[in-house]
């Protein structure tokens, strides 16, 4: 306000809108993911860090295996409780493929427009959670082109737990899911041993996601 | 808008190598939002592809040719290029380039490559 | 590789009439990634509809698609003269990139 009580042009608290952050998850359901409710319990503790609201955060959920599907949209729900109640109730969809490429070129097309919630001017985060390497790895270059094209900024989760199970080298997979991760790579990439360690990444992946909000 | 021309030999000698170029025009090889296609008919038969090349030089073959191919791209001539080994008369096809998107949705009008001594 | 079986291999039809083009796979195919393509003697493919029932740009609305899973069907809801020619379908979610043999559609 000026000396004599007049409203100036004024600046909205830095709290405020830096809590500001469209959010879409992308999970990997394919046969393999097991037990599944190692991923809706890594989904609690993570969300339930979250200040989720229209004006805060915005959570969308998307699972793939062969298909995709939205589980719900960043608008759908309007606080941390509701989120929480329907993130538990997600079910496994399976799919003997993993079509790693399509979820994240689905959620980029589909659940970050506007007609699914998503907030002009909000920075927009995307979580990539999977457990193999893409059938349709071939198409993952033009995908994260698109994502990076539309600042898209990605963190991706390698769970190992389907190679360190049949022994299997995982060099391959770590290189496809490190790709799609935003630079620099190091704060944007986490791997798990298995899908019940998802848990011991969740205070990591939720600061280094709070920090995009300075 | 983006138009596509192949060019090279029309007449190859068995064993040697098929070499064309694809140049694109009315657009950028490097806008990252496209992979480039290189596909084959033989006469009167189905498309077969060969490959594609991302503009960071990220190749993807078909395995069936896969030890005999290379795509290579070349963004300041905004052209990228197919080259295949050791051809045999079954290699006599028509060869068009392709800009894959979602489906490839801009096709060069094909040239026809003969394997003939 | 996923193998696309097309059939019938030749239809024959008259203008005006409605076509009905099958495309099956030897494997499930997301639907995001399987497109059809028409082509005429002497001419490149032209690409008619992605994600199995989306229309190409300037793609006239008798074209339209359908499926999911291992079948997919292209229709053409009255044929026009220029419609008769060979019609494709094509996956690209898996590699190879793999396309059906082509349903000629004829004149009657």
């Known amino acids: 306000v000026s000396p004599t009580f007049q409203v100036v042009n004024s600046i909205a608290p830095v709290q405020e809108c830096s809590t500001q952050l469209d959010i879409v998850i992308v999970l990997d359901g394919s046969n393999s993911i097991y037990p599944w409710d190692s991923v809706t319990a890594f989904l609690n503790d993570l969300l339930k860090r979250m200040d989720i609201g229209p004006k805060q955060t915005q959570v969308g959920i998307v699972q793939y295996g062969e298909n995709v599907t939205h589980e719900f949209n960043l608008n759908k729900y309007s606080s941390t409780e509701e989120v929480l109640v329907a993130a538990k109730k997600i079910v496994q969809r399976g799919g003997r493929q993993t079509m790693t490429a399509l979820g994240i070129d689905t959620a980029r097309k589909e659940a970050f427009t506007e007609a699914r919630g998503a907030r002009r001017g909000v920075k927009k985060v995307m979580v990539i959670v999977t457990d193999g390497e893409s059938h349709d790895n071939h198409r993952l270059k033009k995908v994260i082109q698109d994502c990076e094209d539309e600042n898209i900024q990605r963190f991706s989760i390698a769970i190992l737990g389907s190679y360190n199970r049949g022994n299997l080298s995982t060099e391959k997979f770590v290189e496809e899911i490190k790709s799609i991760a935003s630079e620099p790579t190091e704060k944007h990439f986490f791997n798990v041993s298995d899908e019940l360690a998802l848990v011991t990444i969740v205070k990591t992946l939720g600061e280094r996601i709070f920090a995009l909000e300075a | 808008q983006v138009q596509l021309q192949e060019s090279g030999p029309g007449l190859v000698k068995p064993s040697q190598t098929l070499s064309l170029t694809c140049t694109v025009s009315?657009?950028?090889?490097?806008?990252?939002?496209?992979?480039w296609s290189w596909i084959r008919q033989h006469p009167g038969k189905g498309l077969e592809w060969i490959g594609y090349?991302?503009?960071?030089?990220?190749?993807y073959y078909n395995p069936s040719l896969k030890s005999r191919v290379t795509i290579s791209v070349d963004t300041s001539k905004n052209q990228f290029s197919l080259k295949l080994s050791s051809v045999t008369a079954a290699d006599t096809a028509v060869y068009y380039c392709?800009?894959?998107?979602?489906?490839?949705?801009?096709w060069g009008q094909g040239t026809t490559v003969t394997v003939s001594s | 590789e996923i193998v696309l079986t097309q059939s019938p291999g030749t239809l024959s039809l008259s203008p005006g009439e409605r076509a009905t083009l099958s495309c099956r796979a030897s494997?499930?195919?997301?639907?995001?990634?399987l497109v059809w393509y028409q082509q005429k003697p002497g001419q490149a493919p032209r690409l008619l509809l992605y994600?199995?029932?989306s229309r190409a740009t300037g793609i006239p609305d008798r074209f339209s698609g359908s499926g999911s899973g291992t079948d997919f069907t292209l229709t053409i809801s009255r044929l026009e003269p220029e419609d008769f020619a060979v019609y494709y379908c094509?996956?690209?979610?898996?590699?190879?990139?793999?396309f059906g043999g082509g349903t000629k559609v004829e004149i009657k």
């Open positions: 392709a800009r894959d998107g979602y489906g490839m949705d801009v």
């Open positions: 009315g657009g950028s090889i490097s806008r990252g939002n496209y992979y």
């Open positions: 090349i991302f503009y960071s030089g990220s190749t």
């Open positions: 494997q499930s195919v997301s639907s995001s990634y």
């Open positions: 994600d199995a029932s």
């Open positions: 094509q996956q690209y979610g898996n590699s190879p990139l793999t």
